[in-house]
């Protein structure tokens, strides 16, 4: 059987697959998924290995019309480096010479300057090019190679291994060489895979059942460290509770060098955040940190300095801490908008079982703002999801020059932020460089400001506007209001009406359903429309909602189903990557972010059309 990294190299025109008959004869044959000689896989960013021979595809020289054969894999060899060129062409790196079969009655696969159909290759059984099954570096643990990546294939006791092995061990632990010749270099590490005994790589906190892995012997960049954690279904460490910091201080007390944790300010327009999307509500900076020097966007925990945190350049090579297991954040359930009949007094706006009101004109210090909200039967607003924040931004009349108190503060316990209404902190969205908690003035309260409504800590004595929030009162079944310019069941936002399509549909079916309603699958023109849509669908239990974006027409170029330019994107991490497909909005912890899915997957969807009676603004000129 093929493992997920392996593939057959298929030419559609000949309807044949590449077959490594011997190291010196790479030819084609009728495709057979059980034939070892037809299985290949990427073993580096640019090398393709024959699974049968554990040798790599290469050429004797970068010249036209030379035979492609198999060579001992050498990551430094220029003659073994392949790349995908516009779509399904496979060529030797840096040259216009392609992997070709069928010219001049030649039986072998040749390197050839022609880029016609006989130089085009796909993964057998798919429409994808070979690079879609690309190489993913596997970072090792323990061992003696400082966490370096596995080198496949590697030689151990004169035998070649294309995968992690337990050879030489009686306990089943899987390891790999980190250079191609373990016998000479003696460099290796354990694989970040599940095997019997691999739990002992983790320390479990008996109080919370969360597990931590301290990789103090590794030397990786922040991004590599994060990848290593993710390969173990974990994430770089986040610390949201004082108990957690205390436990980790103990766990790392015998160490001296810094260890990467998940804290970073890598997002272009927002502030400090945890890579696992935990809220940044507990601060334990080293005095003088975070330093404002550009580029110091990643954070290390300093065992030698009482496990306090310091921001560094992300390319520094350090050890790291991974975290996996239960998180305390999931215990607080926010009701989805559709579950809650929401009735609010005049001038209050309903959302998901609560009512909200902006007080912009009567400026108050935080303490007085809180008193006013409580007198009105509520509290300064707490915000628990991106959807709730996006509701406030897109539907409450929030303005880009606003600076408004919200309920977050660290008045009770310094450097530990809590909501004034007592609800748990499950979400934060800080402005770039925030929270700054400037030492020369006590910044214990939090405001929402700027075009995105992100947050900053602020001295509590500033007179500012504020946002109140209270629980709505349920009064029997909700009256469905028909919004002006929209049909019943549609929701209005600015010039448009929107409707959730409730039947699970493929992209094409969803598009057709919208068209039948004289509408189209939603486009998303800017940050504010995105905010509205996030608040519209984000709290719902379904995982995905189709938008009108896809690269069906031209692979690699995403277009809306209607003739409108793509002027705004909101991709999830690692998206769109090389995956062709159709775009859906995520819900839940990644609320509103865009993922590329296979177009025949089934999801709910959002339809959109111009509201009636609206004058169309002129199309922007480019």
């Amino acid at each position: 059987l093929l493992d997920t990294r392996q593939f057959l190299i298929y030419n559609e025109d000949h309807k044949r697959c590449v077959d490594a008959v011997s190291p010196s004869a790479v030819q084609t044959a009728a495709c057979n998924q059980d034939a070892e000689s037809q299985k290949f896989r990427w073993v580096s960013e640019s090398q393709i290995m024959s699974v049968a021979f554990k040798l790599c595809l290469g050429v004797p020289s970068k010249t036209d019309w030379v035979a492609i054969t198999l060579y001992a894999c050498d990551s430094k060899s220029e003659f073994q480096k392949w790349e995908c060129k516009n779509d399904t062409l496979l060529g030797i790196k840096g040259e216009d010479l392609f992997f070709n079969y069928g010219n001049r009655q030649e039986k072998n696969i040749m390197l050839y300057k022609g880029s016609g159909l006989w130089s085009r290759w796909k993964i057998y059984g798919t429409t994808d090019n070979l690079c879609s099954r690309g190489y993913e570096a596997m970072y090792t643990l323990l061992g003696n190679a400082n966490g370096a990546t596995c080198a496949f294939p590697f030689k151990f006791e004169n035998k070649w291994y294309a995968d992690c092995t337990s050879a030489g061990r009686s306990d089943g632990w899987l390891w790999c060489g980190t250079t191609t010749d373990y016998d000479t270099d003696k460099l290796f590490g354990y694989c970040p895979l599940k095997f019997e005994g691999s739990e002992s790589l983790w320390n479990k906190d008996p109080l919370t059942s969360v597990s931590y892995q301290i990789n103090s012997k590794s030397a990786l960049t922040w991004h590599q460290a994060r990848k290593s954690c993710q390969q173990q279904n974990a994430e770089l460490l986040s610390i949201t509770e004082i108990h957690e910091q205390t436990y980790l201080t103990g766990l790392t007390s015998s160490l001296t060098s810094g260890l990467w944790i998940g804290l970073n300010s890598l997002s272009f327009n927002s502030g400090w955040q945890w890579s696992d999307r935990s809220p940044f509500r507990y601060l334990n900076w080293l005095p003088g940190s975070p330093s404002a020097e550009p580029g110091k966007s990643c954070v290390s925990l300093n065992p030698g300095k009482n496990a306090k945190w310091e921001n560094l350049e992300c390319v520094q090579k350090l050890g790291y801490i991974c975290k996996k297991g239960n998180t305390t954040l999931n215990s607080f359930v926010i009701p989805s908008e559709s579950d809650v009949p929401t009735h609010c007094p005049s001038q209050w706006w309903p959302y998901a079982g609560h009512c909200y009101k902006i007080h912009r004109d009567e400026k108050k210090i935080q303490r007085d703002a809180l008193t006013t909200c409580r007198k009105e039967g509520g509290d300064l607003t707490s915000i628990h999801t991106i959807e709730e924040l996006d509701f406030i931004i897109s539907q409450l009349g929030y303005e880009p020059n606003d600076e408004l108190w919200i309920g977050l503060n660290d008045i009770k316990i310094q450097m530990y932020f809590e909501w004034s209404d007592g609800t748990p902190v499950t979400f934060t969205k800080w402005l770039r460089g925030e929270p700054s908690h400037e030492n020369n003035r006590q910044e214990d309260c939090v405001v929402m400001k700027g075009k995105d409504g992100y947050w900053a800590d602020r001295g509590c004595e500033w007179p500012l506007g504020y946002i109140c929030k209270m629980k709505s009162r349920s009064q029997g079944p909700e009256i469905v209001e028909v919004e002006k310019g929209c049909r019943k069941g549609w929701k209005k936002h600015h010039f448009y009406c929107y409707m959730i399509g409730h039947t699970l549909s493929t992209f094409a079916e969803a598009n057709q359903t919208c068209n039948n309603e004289n509408a189209y699958l939603t486009t998303i023109e800017d940050r504010y429309e995105q905010a509205f849509l996030t608040s519209f669908v984000g709290l719902r239990p379904e995982k995905y909602f189709w938008t009108g974006l896809s690269d069906i027409q031209t692979k690699g170029t995403f277009q809306w189903t209607i003739e409108e330019e793509v002027r705004f994107t909101h991709w999830n991490s690692d998206m769109p990557g090389r995956k062709p497909g159709c775009v859906a909005m995520r819900t839940g912890i990644a609320g509103g972010l865009w993922d590329v899915l296979k177009c025949d997957e089934k999801a709910k969807f959002v339809c959109k059309h111009w509201a009636e009676g609206v004058t169309h603004p002129p199309k922007p000129t480019t």
Epitope: L142, G168, R169, D171, K186, F188
Partner: nanobody, 119 residues
Amino acid sequence: DVQLVESGGGLVQPGGVSETLLCSLWKHLHYQCHGWYRQAPGKQREEVAAITSGGSTNYADSVKGRFTISRDNAKNTVYLQMNSLKPEDTAVYYCKAVVVTTTPYSDYWGQGTLVTVSS
């Protein structure tokens, strides 16, 4: 790069006072398992008792109820307490550690300590 040092053993009377063997790891290692093995003259080496890093134990039928394996993580030492010794317990006792270390090889052996049960 791994050394196991055994101590204890010697001449013991049958059924007499218990004897405790010690096995110390030369340096602290991330280890999975420790075991005691023995080899009587002219016989194959056999497993006597084992203890994993999680504290699970396993005993050969011939010693169940008489021998106890235990470990002290702080001292990096594994003990084999032998009670109600019989002449057939006479053998060279070897300590084995299955470790995660700076080589991929997992099994390391001590040099062995002789236990003679004789009146």
